[in-house]
């Protein structure tokens, strides 16, 4: 008589999260009389999957009617396969007794879980830095596999080198996560840049994930500023202008000294955007040139986006 | 052909034993388990006791643990049954019967019967 | 123990009536029960096994249905051959046991 084998043809099938799993088993003999169980692992720790004799397993579906007499077709379905479901699944033929006892187990069939990534996430420096400095962004992406990925980052559509990149766990796992970090070396015209972190992935059919950051978010560009004096008006009064250019982010504050006394302080408010998305701001101050019997020192002190203030002084002649 | 044969009536005293055998043809003998049922006369079907013809392993009702006995012989493909210290309401006829199930436990081929008289 | 509750124990009907039983068991057995039919001085024969599955070379007049604890067996339209007792049985787990039988009488 022909002995009883266990019989799983395929060695490995590989299943997208979300859909269903047909894991395939045949026995070549009904007898000896005796369920089939399906397990995933070896050993004392194996995890029962399904059990032909009892139990409830909401996900498992058997391929073919297990109450019929002459079945020995046992394979299952599993339904909704996440990640978690990854592993090596074994079709064992048992006999019975008191208890049941194992008889002969089929090869396994390894499931592994195609997973997406999650869309990127780029993340900035936690503070502003200013032109010619290098900043770090970071980029994650979690919850893939297989675990072979790829990651670019692009700054203004013009692919970057300078990037470390990380894929855990290094061993086997259920699934997996990206990080990758990339030194940005910033200009004065960033303020409109973007970087870009771009993930390839086996399950995302040639369609890349990408996550962006803009770098308005990490960069401080410090102003210009020029102080000048406009002619002499009939009424003995001088205007003068505080010019502070090319600045962002918009949060400046402006105060005038006259000779060391703050006359007046301003905020910044709605102010129109220049084409390299920086700010220009004018300030005027009149000076009664009259109330005065020396020379009058103005100074313009810009303290911006919390930077220490940056004075530019002008002194106005009182001709005696 | 598939079939169980049972051997012949016995008619047994008070405190005396039994042993009533089954054997199979027509089919693979190890491959299966035997349970034994018995009936009193004008009563319903009583489950006595399993027994697994590929490995010997046993299990009994209850009420009969220490007084029944299973066996197999798988060179001739006979199941036996032994039951000690006969009484009068063992009096009954004594069923093999194939399980067939693979999960679950039924009876898809039966012997004849035997019937066991207890009297004095 | 489980226990196998049959129901009714006896019923008279005539050829062609459609006769229900029905079988209850104490807790739940799943599928795992099969129907038996047994006629006078002879040994029962399997009808129905796992709860609704024909036994090879039994007429479909017989049917089997439920799960859990609640079952039932159906002869559509009984014929001069089916008068006879009828037994479940249930198969989860040892030790197994039997209704008290339902015998088929003719009216």
């Known amino acids: 008589e022909e002995e009883l084998q266990v019989i799983q043809p395929e060695k490995s099938v590989s299943v997208a999260a979300g859909e269903s799993a047909t894991l395939n088993c045949t026995a070549t003999s009904l007898i000896p009389v005796g369920p089939i169980q399906w397990f995933r692992g070896v050993g004392p720790g194996r995890e029962l999957i399904y059990s032909q004799k009892e139990g409830h397993f909401p996900r498992v579906t058997p391929v073919s009617d297990p109450t019929k007499r002459n079945n020995m077709d046992f394979s299952i379905r599993i339904s909704n396969i996440t990640p978690a479901d990854a592993g090596t699944y074994y079709c064992v033929k048992f006999r019975k007794g008191s208890p049941d006892v194992e008889l002969k187990s089929g090869a396994g069939t390894e499931l592994s879980v195609r997973a997406k990534p999650s869309a990127p996430v780029v993340s900035g420096p936690a503070v502003r830095a200013t032109a010619e400095h290098t900043v770090s962004f970071t980029c994650e992406s979690h919850g893939f596999s297989p675990r072979d990925i790829t990651l670019k980052w692009f700054k203004n559509g013009n692919e970057l080198s300078d990037f470390q990149t990380n894929v855990d766990p290094a061993g086997k796992s259920v699934s997996y996560s990206i990080r990758s970090t990339a030194r940005v070396v910033l200009t004065r015209r960033d303020v409109h840049s973007q970087v870009i972190c771009e993930v390839a992935h086996v399950t995302l059919q040639g369609d890349p994930l990408r996550g962006t950051a803009n770098l308005s978010e990490a960069i401080r560009v410090p102003p210009f500023l020029e102080v000048t004096q406009q002619s002499m008006r009939a009424d003995n009064q001088v205007n003068v202008t505080c010019q502070v250019t090319k600045f962002y982010p918009q949060r400046l504050q402006l105060t005038w000294l006259e000779n060391g006394n703050v006359s007046r302080t301003e905020m910044a408010s709605a102010l129109p955007e220049n084409k390299d998305g920086t700010y220009n701001w004018t300030s005027w101050l009149l000076v009664n040139v009259s109330a005065h019997r020396d020379d009058v020192k103005l100074t313009c002190q810009v303290e911006h986006d919390g930077q220490p203030a940056v004075n530019k002084s002008f002194s106005v002649k009182v001709s005696a | 052909q598939v079939q169980l044969v049972q051997s012949g009536a016995e008619v047994k005293k008070p405190g005396a034993s039994v042993k009533v055998s089954c054997k199979a043809s027509?089919?693979?003998?190890?491959?299966?388990?035997i349970s034994w049922v018995r009936q009193a006369p004008g009563q319903g079907l009583e489950w006595m006791g399993w027994?697994?013809?590929?490995?010997?392993?046993?299990n009994y009702a209850q009420k009969l643990q220490g007084r029944v006995t299973m066996t197999t012989d798988t060179s001739t493909s006979t199941a036996y049954m032994e039951l000690r210290s006969l009484r009068s309401d063992d009096t009954a006829v004594y069923y093999c019967?194939?399980?067939?199930?693979?999960?679950?436990?039924?009876?898809?081929?039966w012997g004849r019967g035997t019937l066991v008289t207890v009297s004095s | 123990d489980i226990q196998m509750t049959q129901s009714p124990s006896s019923v008279s009907a005539s050829v062609g009536d459609r006769v229900t039983i029905t079988c209850r068991a104490s807790q739940g057995i799943s599928s795992w029960l099969a129907w038996y039919q047994q006629k006078p001085g002879k040994a029962p024969k399997l009808l129905i096994y796992?709860?609704?599955n024909l036994q090879s070379g039994v007429p479909s007049r017989f049917s089997g249905s439920g799960s859990g604890t609640d079952f039932t067996l159906t002869i559509s339209s009984l014929q001069p051959e089916d008068f006879a007792t009828y037994y479940c049985q249930q198969g989860a787990s040892f030790p197994i046991t039997f209704g008290g039988g339902t015998k088929v009488e003719i009216k």
């Open positions: 027509g089919y693979t003998f190890g491959g299966y388990g």
């Open positions: 796992a709860a609704s």
């Open positions: 019967a194939r399980e067939a199930g693979s999960s679950w436990y039924d009876f898809d081929l």
């Open positions: 027994i697994s013809a590929y490995g010997g392993e046993t």
